[in-house]
């Protein structure tokens, strides 16, 4: 059933934990509550996952289908250039940013956006599915 569809929820796919969504070889967690960027990162790490790092435009497009206008933290920071938490550069998309003090990245259904890291937003975790 999981292999037969592009994505599925935990109800139809036991290989991701409860409240996580499966897509491809990964599980995604879309939070309901809000935290600042660091707390969101810590939440993901505590669950053997990481704050969302998007690998390509296809994944980004799919994930944006699940999002509303509300921004969600992703594992993207401006540290001498926009980089994902694993150190890889953001290269398949642009991030809307024109403030030098907004150094954390967030995503909604329309775009990647810079924000002050202390703003409380929802977030997305990602991990390899079992």
């Amino acid at each position: 059933l999981c292999q037969g569809s592009k994505y599925s929820t935990c109800a139809s796919c036991p290989s991701c934990p409860d409240h996580w969504m499966k897509y491809g070889n990964h599980c995604y967690y879309f939070s309901v509550e809000k935290k600042d960027w660091i707390s969101s990162l810590e939440f993901c790490l505590a669950r053997d996952s990481h704050l969302l790092m998007i690998t390509d435009k296809q994944e980004m497009s799919l994930l944006q289908d699940f999002l509303s206008e509300a921004f969600h933290w992703v594992g993207l920071r401006n540290n001498s250039g926009w980089r994902w938490e694993d150190g890889s550069p953001l290269n398949f998309s642009r991030i809307y940013s024109n403030s030098l003090v907004q150094t954390c990245g967030a995503i909604n259904k329309n775009s990647l956006q810079a924000s002050s890291c202390e703003v409380s937003l929802q977030w997305v975790c990602k991990k390899v599915s079992p």
């Epitope: 600042d36 024109n98 002050s116 202390e118």
Partner: antibody, heavy 125, light 112 residues
Amino acid sequence: QVILKESGPGILQPSQTLSLTCSFSGFSLTTFGMGIGWIRHPSGKALEWLAHIWWNDDKSYNSALKSRLTISKDTSKNQVFLRLANVATADTATYYCARTIYYGNYLTFYAMEHWGQGTSVTVSS
Amino acid sequence: DVLLTQTPLSLPVSLGDQASISCRSSQNIVHSNGNTYLEWYLLKPGQSPKLLIFKVSNRFSGVPDKFSGSGSGTDFTLKIRRVEAEDLGIYYCFQGSHVPPTFGAGTKLELK
């Protein structure tokens, strides 16, 4: 490149209403986390925050002047407006608009990275 | 309201000197999120204010490292190494941690 520019009447008489416009470019006031504030500088005195407005139309005012202040925006024209009613000579100052950044509290802000050149306002009878 | 008291109000210096400006707040300005939104601005005659330092000690882009900010709680300091003519003007501290945001009275850095 972010640019802000204030415009106003220059001179007005006591009891009149001061109307100021901040025209900006290089960013959109519909973008999450963006705001514009008004600050004034009376000659020989300290800078004073007056009001600001956020991308989501939340507003905040200096409590001592709140009854006289109104801030608004026209995002389609990239403009923010400030009205100060019933002006007195004490309102004579240079008025600046500045872009403000949201950190989670709509009532305040930080990092005024970009400022306009200022517009001089004199209240005199 | 948070009162920011700057000292001195006037600071005469010779070029090449180090200048130090103090900003004391009437209450602790650590925000509940753990950050301290204390900033320093420079206002030169005929110009608009320029952001120098944000969150106590972070230099804004393009601000030379001769400017440094420090402090915590209620006591903050701006230091300027080797003062040059272009550094002269009025320095203001500002806090955005508490409502309403407030400025200090300013410190005029001028030549002796």
